[in-house]
């Protein structure tokens, strides 16, 4: 999880704590940096990043995606609807981030950092959305069986799944970051 202050700020005359929006923005950028590092290892290890067979594996996954109805895009943007979608989506990604935990050798700590930082980000966003009650939490039983199913895949599918999770999570966070900047 990133420190609450930039090292540059230490010299500042008044070290004020980060505001809610600053914390969220910084947290997302920190997670995106972590995803970049994990993607680097994935792409170096296999040719998944250039594979044209993504659609095969994608059928098995139900990764959260921003859609027009979620109100997070420039056209039809809706602050409340979008905030609910971001939080719901992040909660849905948690099971996939759990899956990633044993998928990395040299970046094992980075994978853990991405997972833990996402939990913190969810907490930040839930505080921001304290008056919104439309947030549904994924069912733990469904998540457990999904995790078992993903871990039972063959090696090629596991590699492809890892690649797709990282790519989708990156896209989701980038869309979230853009949307949050209008909030």
């Amino acid at each position: 999880v990133p420190p609450g202050e930039d090292s540059k700020d230490v010299a500042a005359p008044h070290r004020q704590p980060l505001t809610s929006s600053e914390r969220i923005d910084k947290q997302i950028r920190y997670i995106l940096d972590g995803i970049s590092a994990l993607r680097k290892e994935t792409c170096n290890k296999s040719n998944m990043c250039e594979s044209s067979k993504e659609a095969l594996a994608e059928n098995n996954l139900n990764l959260p995606k921003m859609a027009e109805k979620d109100g997070c895009f420039q056209s039809g943007f809706n602050e409340e609807t979008c905030l609910v979608k971001i939080i719901t989506g992040l909660l849905e990604f948690e099971v996939y981030l759990e899956y990633l935990q044993n998928r990395f050798e040299s970046s094992e700590e980075q994978a853990r950092a991405v997972q833990m930082s996402t939990k913190v980000l969810i907490q930040f966003l839930q505080k921001k959305a304290k008056n919104l009650d439309a947030i549904t939490t994924p069912d733990p039983t469904t998540n457990a069986s999904l995790l078992t199913k993903l871990q039972a895949q063959n090696q090629w599918l596991q590699d492809m799944t890892t690649h797709l999770i990282l790519r989708s999570f990156k896209e989701f966070l980038q869309s979230s970051l853009r949307a949050l900047r209008q909030m």
Partner: antibody
Framework: EVQLVESGGGLVQPGGSLRLSCAAS????????MSWVRQAPGKGLEWVSR????????YYADSVKGRFTISRDNAKNTLYLQMNSLKPEDTAVYYC?????????????WGQGTQVTVSS | SYDLTQPPSVSGSPGKTVTISCAGT?????????VSWYQQLPGMAPKILIY???KRASGIADRFSGSKSGNTASLTISGLQSEDEADYYC??????????FGGGTHLTVLG
Amino acid sequence: EVQLVESGGGLVQPGGSLRLSCAASGFTFSSYAMSWVRQAPGKGLEWVSRISSGGISTYYADSVKGRFTISRDNAKNTLYLQMNSLKPEDTAVYYCVRYAWGVQWAFDFWGQGTQVTVSS
Amino acid sequence: SYDLTQPPSVSGSPGKTVTISCAGTSSDVGYGNYVSWYQQLPGMAPKILIYDVNKRASGIADRFSGSKSGNTASLTISGLQSEDEADYYCASYRRGETIVFGGGTHLTVLG
């Protein structure tokens, strides 16, 4: 074509009130955070206030906090600035500005401004 | 006094290059890549040139470029043209959800 047209400026006595309006057209108003920026005669620019796209969050410069209130009506595509307890130092051209989409803290469109003069 | 420090004026001949500096602190210019630059022609509203330190706004010529080092941002205008004569303002996000501007720099194109 994006257009921001301010109105409601004028001459007011110290301690008085004014309500500025900004009519937006040519874009989906409800998708954008908006701000007011002012410019005193012959001086530089000063950020005044910001409101999120849905009107949930508002922010103010210290110089106007407690006196000015920013609001918006997305159904009418209109941004407002209610100015109370006006002081001579509030005399300026007030610009209605749009935040660039997905960019933090940059204004991609500006209105032509409305003049506010606070004088006895 | 303004929160960000800009030189009051700069000048250059047509075709030449000028750079306008914008000095701040670690709480604003140095905090993140949230610096933007605006051009204001006489009697007109400001117009965005650069955002996020070095990204050119739509329709802005590549003669305009932005950069940042530490707590100081810079706007560079190359191949100066007479129509570049205007006031230029830098702006930056400041920690605590506010925006601060520089005092403005008047660019004179000589000759």
